[in-house]
């Protein structure tokens, strides 16, 4: 049967200090997020089916203005990558908040069963947990 | 048969004062916009088939520079949401123009037959009607 | 059989002076880029199957800060369009870097066999060749 594995997640919380990862949650009880195939393992998205996926993300910084993002010497950056297994670790998508408070992007990428995707937000600014401002999803598009 | 409902719309006009909605149009006679399944009701997109959709939008402000977006105390904001039926009203996707003149994003979301999507642009700046700068679309991806 | 034509490309190089086009490359030997259906002709993407496609792009400027993009009188702009055949030449998607260093967007558009897509970057700033910062892809979604 067609895979059609698909997930759309909302932000649960940020990690403890020294852990730049965003922790996600999904499920109809939480609103409009869902997991249909992929798994969430300790807040990180794990792929269940090999294939080419469309990965998309939007992250909005909370309590943010153009000046708050431009003030910092090192811009706040969001990177989406495969963080495990270690042998497949790679950055898939990276964006910086330059005088902006939201980043949004998408890309096609091959993913394999067991790949765990991490979304690392580096910088001192915190992301908004509003479900229409910060979300992360994948969609299986072909084998 | 597979749904494959899909639409890509171009901006027709903005609403009268006090109406923040953008009004869309679509069809091959207009260029590269089209409606294959969904309907346009008074310039708003109405869904005809239940399922999970990829919703995407790009809006570019006309006569815009970084200073024109940053000058305003309240940033210009674009929100895409279900505006009717009222019982299902919710904001799906929200972005602000912080010192930028274009926003673009996308997300996966469950939509139901009869859901009407509205795109609300709040602020005093006007959107460009150029078809390569401002567009809005949905794509059915799975039941 | 289902088309499922799909491609994800990484930046190879920019064009010579007076040629604003970005030149792309793809294939598993290069990393996570691939061509499954479409072709690359002198670094430009050529469509082989008629249909509606989701076109997406992200371009990040190298050696960039908010000041470097805002300093220029004419903002750096990225346009994706059909550049050949000449009879079908049109701009599909256009974005400017206003005090930002990355643009990312996507849209649905009908494409026909033989359409060659060009990505024109105008301005003096150069794009990053990092594969997680600059990429361009298409996905056939329906006839």
């Amino acid at each position: 049967s067609l895979g059609w594995d698909i997930a759309e997640l909302q932000l649960n919380h940020t990690g403890p200090q020294q852990d730049p990862r965003l922790y996600w949650q999904g499920g109809p009880a939480l609103g409009r997020s869902f997991l249909r195939g992929p798994e969430l393992d300790k807040g990180q998205l794990r792929i269940r089916r090999d294939g080419i996926y469309m990965v998309h993300i939007q992250v909005t910084l909370a309590i943010c203005s153009s000046t708050s993002t431009s003030r910092h010497h090192h811009p706040t950056t969001l990177a989406v990558g495969i963080c495990s297994p270690a042998s497949r670790s790679i950055s898939l998508l990276r964006l910086s908040f330059h005088q902006g408070c939201t980043i949004a992007s998408q890309r096609l990428t091959p993913l394999a069963r067991g790949d765990t995707l991490c979304t690392n937000l580096t910088g001192t600014l915190l992301p908004s947990r509003n479900t229409d401002e910060t979300f992360f999803g994948v969609q299986w598009v072909r084998p | 048969s597979l749904g494959w409902d899909i639409a890509e719309l171009q901006l027709n006009h903005t609403g009268p004062q006090q109406d923040p909605r953008l009004y869309w149009q679509g069809g091959p006679a207009l260029g590269r916009s089209f409606l294959r399944g969904p309907e346009l009701d008074k310039g708003q997109l109405r869904i005809r088939r239940d399922g999970i959709y990829m919703v995407h939008i790009q809006v570019t402000l006309a006569i815009c520079s970084s200073t024109s977006t940053s000058r305003h105390h309240h940033p210009t904001t674009l929100a895409v949401g279900i505006c009717s039926p009222a019982s299902r009203s919710i904001s799906l996707l929200r972005l602000s123009f912080h010192q930028g003149c274009t926003i673009a994003s996308q997300r996966l979301t469950p939509l139901a037959r009869g859901d009407t999507l509205c795109t609300n642009l709040t602020g005093t700046l006007l959107p460009s009607r150029n078809t390569d700068e401002t567009f809005f679309g949905v794509q059915w991806v799975r039941p | 059989s289902l088309g499922w034509d799909i491609a994800e490309l990484q930046l190879n190089h920019t064009g010579p002076q007076q040629d604003p086009r970005l030149y792309w490359q793809g294939g598993p030997a290069l990393g996570r880029s691939f061509l499954r259906g479409p072709e690359l002709d002198k670094g430009q993407l050529r469509i082989r199957r008629d249909g509606i496609y989701m076109v997406h792009i992200q371009v990040t400027l190298a050696i960039c800060s908010s000041t470097s993009t805002s300093r220029h009188h004419h903002p750096t702009t990225l346009a994706v369009g059909i550049c050949s055949p000449a009879s079908r030449s049109i701009s599909l998607l256009r974005l400017s870097f206003h005090q930002g260093c990355t643009i990312a967007s996507q849209r649905l558009t009908p494409l026909a066999r033989g359409d060659t897509l060009c990505t024109n970057l105008t301005g003096t700033l150069l794009p990053s060749r990092n594969t997680d910062e600059t990429f361009f892809g298409v996905q056939w979604v329906r006839p």
Epitope: S1, G26, G27, F34, L35, G37, E39, L40, R113 | - | -
Partner: antibody, heavy 115, light 112 residues
Framework: ELQVVESGGGLVQPGGSLRLSCAAS????????MHWVRQAPRKGLEWVST????????YYADSVKGRFTISRDHAKNTLILQMNSLKSEDTAVYYC????????WGQGTQVTVSS | QTVVTQEPSLSVSPGGTVTLTCGLS?????????PGWFQQTPGQAPRTLIY???SRHSGVPSRFSGSISGNKAALTITGAQPEDEADYYC???????????FGGGTHLTVLG
Amino acid sequence: ELQVVESGGGLVQPGGSLRLSCAASGFTLSNYWMHWVRQAPRKGLEWVSTISTDNSRTYYADSVKGRFTISRDHAKNTLILQMNSLKSEDTAVYYCIRGSDYEHWGQGTQVTVSS
Amino acid sequence: QTVVTQEPSLSVSPGGTVTLTCGLSSGSVTTTNYPGWFQQTPGQAPRTLIYSTSSRHSGVPSRFSGSISGNKAALTITGAQPEDEADYYCALEEIGSYTYMFGGGTHLTVLG
């Protein structure tokens, strides 16, 4: 601490029914694919059933198809195996397992089908 | 019906190396069968050693490794310990179907 604990086993007559439960603690059950595997006395492991994260996909071994139903009780963070029309050959220890890679096993619950 | 085959029993000396295999009665095992290996000691529930051919589960000693060798999945124990005496089961996923098949198990004896 992360745990899966099976319950609901017992002695039942052929043709009878049992409802096994697997209670999850330390994680949200609906975030994972879940499985039931059984082991008859002095025999090997036999896969019984699997359910996907959103419950839209359920899979069964031929030996239990049409008799067993896998489901979740989201409110109780519990996995269910409803077993009907039980046969003597269904006698086994039933294990609940978390994750597509079978990463966490419960201790099992004994089901005995006998007259 | 396809059957998953394993050696019924094997033995190894302490500190020695042993390889257990997992095949299909018809066809070859590939990485897309996502071979898994499970260890069961008497009176205990099974525990996962290896998943997706070669990924070691957390807490599993590095002496356990998984691979595809020829047309079979293989579990190699390098430097066997007395506590490795147990039953070992392999499981394969039917390609594209999300249904699973376990082998009959291999009883490993650590001599001495």
